[in-house]
Interface confidence: low
């Protein structure tokens, strides 16, 4: 009988820059044979495709078979429970995943001190699994922006500051001397994605840094 | 040179308000960044909110919702209105702002909480908030 297992409660995306993740929720009660099958469905081309028969956890990493979701209409995916001959009812995600669902990250923040100043570079990210011609400037070719907060050590002070339109920066600390630490949050400006907040990166300043001039 | 002249403390009750304006004279048309800072008895000063020559603001996480910074840049002059005002936030407030140009051309000037960012003070006006 097909439809005697319950249906995962709900099915999502969690996407970064070519980290494309489908999420679902367990049935419940499900049993140690209870296992879960993924299908695609893109856009244009009305017809599911089987991506996993049986997957044991409640996540599937689909980066491999959206990897034209930057150039395309975007997917659905549907999962549904299996337990031997027994399976549920699909459930499909309630959203399109298109290039909007994408969480914007960067790949690292570079800092270093000149003469006074910090000078901080964006690292955009490099996934492997991206192909060569599709990086993120390519893809966010316009309008690519970044928030920078900044937090003073010793102090636990942090200041959000404007948005800067360039994968480079500076921060003036002419006199003072410390631990800086700067976080950057991406976004492009013509767009809704959503953002992260990238890992705090650390600089520590101390005199030796400033030149003196007459 | 720049000039810079706070006005509109005074004494106000807790979840009162006040407008604070700063009144900038002289060399105006440089300035990048400026900002309000406050500095109460035995401690720091300390910023409050900074505005851009863009419109950018930013605001202490102790303020924010509560105080807006703008400018009126036909006037030359800078506020702050204070709303829900607390017993904490009695300080000599300080108007300040900033002509200098760092960095390149391919660098975004950032207006800061810190003080060594800004060359030009005004004189203060105090704000006292009682419960």
């Known amino acids: 009988h097909g439809t005697e297992l319950p249906s995962p409660p709900s099915v999502w995306f969690e996407a970064e820059f070519f980290h494309h993740i489908l999420h679902w929720t367990p049935i419940p009660n499900q049993s140690e044979s209870t296992c879960y099958e993924v299908a695609l469905l893109r856009y244009g081309i009305e017809s599911w495709n089987s991506i996993s028969n049986c997957s044991q956890t409640l996540s599937y990493d689909l980066t491999a078979v959206t990897l034209d979701l930057y150039h395309s209409n975007g997917y659905r995916a549907r999962v549904r429970a299996v337990d031997g001959s027994r399976h549920s009812n699909w459930t499909v995600t309630n959203t399109r995943f298109s290039v909007d669902e994408v969480t914007l990250t960067v790949g690292s923040v570079n800092l270093e001190i000149h003469n006074g100043f910090i000078l901080g570079k964006i690292q955009l990210p490099r996934p492997k699994m991206a192909p060569a011609n599709d990086t993120y400037e390519s893809i966010f070719s316009h309008f690519r922006e970044y928030e920078i907060a900044i937090r003073k050590v010793p102090g636990n002070f942090t200041f959000t500051h404007k948005k800067v339109k360039h994968e480079n920066f500076s921060l003036l600390t002419s006199g003072e001397v410390g631990e800086f630490c700067v976080q950057v949050k991406p976004s492009v400006a013509s767009r809704s994605n959503k953002g992260m907040w990238s890992k705090e990166e650390c600089i520590s300043l101390t005199r030796q840094y400033f030149t003196v001039t007459n | 040179q720049v000039q810079l002249q706070e006005s509109g403390g005074g004494s106000v009750q807790a979840g009162g308000s006040l407008r604070l304006s700063c009144a900038a004279s002289?060399?105006?048309?440089?300035?990048?960044?400026m900002g309000w800072f406050r500095q109460a008895p035995g401690k720091e000063r300390e910023g409050v909110a900074q505005i851009n020559s863009d419109g950018s603001t930013s605001y202490a996480d102790s303020v924010k919702g509560r105080f807006t910074i703008s400018k009126d840049n036909a006037k030359n002059t800078l506020y702050l209105q204070m709303n829900s005002l607390k017993p904490e936030d009695t300080a000599m407030y300080y108007c300040?702002?900033?002509?200098?140009?760092?960095?390149?051309?391919?660098?975004?000037?950032?207006?800061?909480?810190?003080?060594?960012?800004?060359?030009?003070w005004g004189q203060g006006t105090q704000v006292t908030v009682s419960s």
């Open positions: 300040a702002a900033d002509s200098r140009v760092y960095g390149g051309s391919w660098y975004e000037r950032l207006c800061g909480p810190y003080t060594y960012e800004y060359n030009y």
């Open positions: 002289g060399y105006t048309y440089s300035m990048y960044c």
